[in-house]
């Protein structure tokens, strides 16, 4: 179970506002985080940028099998894992793994999911059990999000867990009955 990766493509992207941008549920109450007046770095930094959309982060493509109990998808699904530091797009190297190429002296930026898509998946079950049809929510694109000192530890922790899909053994965040669970329309992927 878990990540069944036979493909791990890394591409540098500059996130833009798409048709269905969706902030992570736990961040939706902070409406001002992406505004220009809250973005960028202190004026003394030589590379000042006003807009978070000028920042870029890495999209890692992973393939995995979807499971439901003993049943597994006939084919793997491909989704993104949002990875790495965020920095001004013009400074972001194309090669991966060049160490600490840029360090902001001001606020921290994290690479987090931006848009999601839903995909219908057919699961095959052992022992002659009927196949199951399920839908999964997959990360479709990533974006840079500015963190400030006002973010508490739990939110920082959530950024870390947003970057990877919940695994068996780790409690995923359910949306059940959560006021923060406001779901923007998902991209239709099938």
């Amino acid at each position: 179970q878990g990540w069944q990766a036979f493909k791990n493509d890394a591409t540098e992207i500059i996130p833009e506002l798409g048709e269905y941008p969706e902030p992570p549920p736990e961040l939706e109450n902070n409406k001002t985080m992406n505004r220009a007046e809250n973005g960028g770095r202190p004026p003394h930094h030589p590379f000042e940028t006003k807009d978070v959309s000028e920042y870029s982060c890495r999209e890692l493509h992973f393939t995995r099998y979807v499971t439901d109990g003993p049943c597994r998808s006939a084919k793997p699904v491909t989704e993104l894992v949002c990875s790495g530091q965020c920095g001004p797009a013009r400074l972001l190297p194309n090669a991966i793994g060049r160490g600490k190429w840029w360090r902001p002296s001001g606020p921290d930026f994290r690479c987090i999911p931006d848009r999601y898509r839903a995909q219908r998946v057919q699961l095959l079950c052992p022992g002659g059990e009927a196949p199951r049809a399920r839908k999964v929510r997959l990360v479709a694109s990533c974006k840079c999000k500015r963190l400030t000192r006002f973010h508490n530890q739990s939110e920082l922790k959530d950024f870390g867990t947003e970057a990877a899909r919940p695994q068996k053994g780790r409690k995923p965040r359910p949306r059940a009955r959560s006021a923060k669970a406001n779901q923007a329309e998902l991209e239709n992927a099938y």
């Epitope: 179970q1 979807v66 499971t67 439901d68 109990g69 003993p70 839903a118 219908r120 059990e129 009927a130 199951r132 049809a133 399920r134 839908k135 999964v136 929510r137 899909r165 919940p166 695994q167 068996k168 780790r170 409690k171 995923p172 965040r173 359910p174 949306r175 059940a176 009955r177 669970a181 406001n182 779901q183 923007a184 329309e185 998902l186 239709n188 099938y190």
Partner: antibody, heavy 122, light 107 residues
Framework: EVQLRQSGADLVKPGASVKLSCTAS????????IHWVKQRPEQGLEWIGR????????TYVPKFQGKATITADTSSNTAYLQLRSLTSEDTAIYYC???????????????WGQGTSVTVSS | EIVLTQSPALMAASPGEKVTITCSVS???????LHWSQQKSGTSPKLWIY???NLASGVPVRFSGSGSGTSYSLTISSMEAEDAATYYC????????FGSGTKLELK
């Protein structure tokens, strides 16, 4: 906020049909399965079936095959349950629910509508 | 069809008391397919525990769930007045089936 808003209570005559609606807000029904459940007075919950609004494909419990028809209109973000040839046995509260998407290989109905009461009486 | 049998059907507990509700499944299922809902009189059900042991958002930590195969349970470590409700176990494999419910009252 994710919400499922169901149509109001219905009083119908035996033999008639009724069509209940379930309008979603805060999410696109095309991306989820919508389930319908029946609860008779002072009794438990009984699954009727579900629909994939994206392609209109529906699944039913054998007991409700022929009795219930589940449809959806994605343009209005609404799912429907039609019940035909009503008898007193169909007097119940009917709930629609959304099957939550995959969060670590768990699938369950994570949001329910407020329910629609159907009373079959002459 | 998978049949879920809950026991007891009705029980009363005093504040602070430990409560355990059991759910027996007619044939073995994966623990990820067993869920619990809470329903209070006149309201719709609420997902309470999913995948046997994961608390849904907003559920107090005094609730817990456990089990595997054909035997599952929901436990309240210390009963509180707001916990009085009917609890249903449910399984979602190829069909959704519910237990008959356990009505928990405050003593």
């Amino acid at each position: 906020e994710v919400q499922l808003r169901q149509s109001g209570a219905d009083l119908v005559k035996p033999g008639a049909s009724v069509k209940l609606s379930c309008t979603a807000s805060g999410f696109n029904i095309k991306d989820y399965y919508i389930h319908w459940v029946k609860q008779r007075p002072e009794q438990g919950l009984e699954w009727i079936g579900r629909i994939d609004p994206d392609n209109g494909e529906s699944t039913y419990v054998p007991k409700f095959q022929g009795k219930a028809t589940i449809t959806a209109d994605t343009s209005s973000n609404t799912a429907y349950l039609q019940l035909r040839s009503l008898t007193s046995e169909d007097t119940a509260i009917y709930y629609c629910g959304r099957e939550g998407l995959d969060y670590g290989d768990y699938y369950a109905v994570d949001y329910w509508g407020q329910g629609t009461s159907v009373t079959v009486s002459s | 069809e998978i049949v879920l049998t809950q026991s007891p059907a009705l029980m009363a507990a005093s504040p602070g008391e430990k409560v355990t509700i059991t759910c027996s499944v007619s044939s073995s299922i994966s623990s990820s397919n067993l869920h619990w809902s809470q329903q209070k009189s006149g309201t719709s059900p609420k997902l309470w525990i999913y995948g046997t042991s994961n608390l849904a958002s907003g559920v107090p930590v005094r609730f817990s769930g456990s089990g595997s195969g054909t035997s599952y349970s929901l436990t309240i470590s210390s009963m509180e007045a707001e916990d009085a409700a009917t609890y249903y176990c449910q399984q979602w494999t190829t069909t959704y089936t519910f237990g008959s419910g356990t009505k928990l009252e405050l003593k």
